[in-house]
Interface confidence: medium
């Protein structure tokens, strides 16, 4: 099979997922495409534990995650349910909740310097984090 049993070189394994942390900046869509080309997606944060792990690795730097509201409602790029899921917004954020073109047009979410989330203009060149899940039940042993 083509199951992934260990993380690629330069990726960090944590709780059955692999993470890659950029050191350069891209617009959200470019970061999104970059992760796709790695068979991954922008990071989807589902718990406090994962939040703390990512925060530890990115430091106090604005960093894109896989959360956007480019069509109205907030959506995680991997389909994880937003409404019932983990959230860590800064106070008063997100401040463009309702609109395309009616407010500030801030449609993409990022980690801020303190780790809490903010929505911002999608074309700002922030760092980003890719995530890909290790297969839960691999049919093959890892190659030695």
């Amino acid at each position: 099979g083509s199951e992934r049993t260990c993380c690629p070189v330069n990726w960090v394994e944590h709780e059955r997922s692999c993470y890659w942390f950029s050191r350069s900046g891209k617009a959200w869509a470019d970061a999104d495409n970059y992760c796709r080309l790695e068979d991954a997606h922008l990071v989807v944060v589902t718990s406090w534990e994962e939040q703390k792990f990512v925060q530890h690795h990115i430091g106090p730097v604005n960093t894109w995650m896989g959360l956007h509201d480019q069509n109205g409602p907030w959506k995680w790029v991997d389909g994880t349910d937003y409404e019932t899921g983990f959230k860590n917004w800064r106070p008063e954020q997100p401040d463009d909740w309702y609109g395309h073109g009616l407010g500030g047009g801030e449609d993409c979410a990022h980690f801020t310097d303190d780790g809490r989330w903010n929505d911002d203009v999608c074309q700002r060149p922030y760092r980003w984090v890719c995530e890909t899940e290790l297969d839960k039940a691999s049919q093959e042993p890892p190659l030695l």
Partner: antibody
Framework: QVQLVESGGGVVQPGRSLRLSCAAS????????MHWVRQAPGKGLEWVAI????????YYADSVKGRFTISRDNSMSTLYLQMNSLRAEDTAVYYC???????????WGQGTMVTVSS | SYELTQPLSVSAALGQTARITCGGN??????VHWYQQKPGQSPVLIIH???DRPSGIPERFSGSNSGNTATLTISRAQAGDEADYYC?????????FGGGTKLPVL
């Protein structure tokens, strides 16, 4: 409501120049990337150029690179396309469009016709 | 440069389902957007990021994307759906459109 209105089209001779404008209203213009797209008579859509929300980045189609320049005035909520060394194959309806964040063209203007003919 | 291939025409019977394909090398790794253009009108974004519908677009319009093919599906086709449909991706600093597909509703 959200609106984009193009102007500046017309008939021009080959080798001459023309500047198109796109007036935006109903949204915070300075927060969005903007595109130009054209459509020759009876043909499909052809992307022309994009400019970042703050003017810091521009990309062009190979067919217009070195001849066309995209620019914007955020204080006037206006997008421009300066077209130099025009050719007959540049004849088309030119649309401006607002970026959505994933390089989708979320809002389109009504278009302005440019005819390059001697 | 990246190329997108669409059929020139796809027909649909009134009330039936139409599927318009957009082929490209590993297109499943890209974000695909779809536009509808009626005669004499500007294009309208109908599907964004493979399968998201902008507000105001009927649920009859849906999209999928994997492998080398993205697909726009129009369920319960109506006379008002007659239009040209274009797919679009972003690749290496340029936006790329497919050649367009004409949809007559019979």
């Amino acid at each position: 409501q959200v609106q984009l209105v193009e102007s500046g089209g017309g008939v021009v001779q080959p080798g001459r120049s023309l500047r198109l404008s796109c007036a935006a209203s109903g949204f915070t213009f300075s927060n969005y990337g903007m595109h130009w797209v054209r459509q020759a008579p009876g043909k499909g859509l052809e992307w022309v150029a994009i400019i970042w929300f703050d003017g810091s980045n521009e990309y062009y189609a190979d067919s217009v690179k070195g001849r066309f320049t995209i620019s914007r005035d955020n204080s006037m909520s206006t997008l421009y396309l300066q077209m130099n060394s025009l050719r007959a194959e540049d004849t088309a309806v030119y649309y401006c469009a607002r970026e959505s964040g994933s390089y989708a063209l979320y809002i389109w203007g009504q278009g302005t016709m440019v005819t390059v003919s001697s | 440069s990246y190329e997108l291939t669409q059929p020139l025409s796809v027909s649909a019977a009134l009330g039936q389902t139409a599927r318009i394909t957009c082929g490209g090398n590993n297109i499943g790794r890209k974000n695909v957007h779809w536009y509808q253009q009626k005669p004499g009108q500007s294009p309208v974004l109908i599907i964004h990021r493979d399968s998201d519908r902008p507000s105001g677009i009927p649920e009859r319009f849906s999209g999928s994307n994997s492998g080398n093919t993205a697909t726009l599906t129009i369920s319960r086709a109506q006379a008002g759906d007659e239009a040209d449909y274009y797919c679009q991706v972003w690749d290496s600093g340029t936006a790329v459109f497919g050649g367009g597909t004409k949809l007559p509703v019979l």
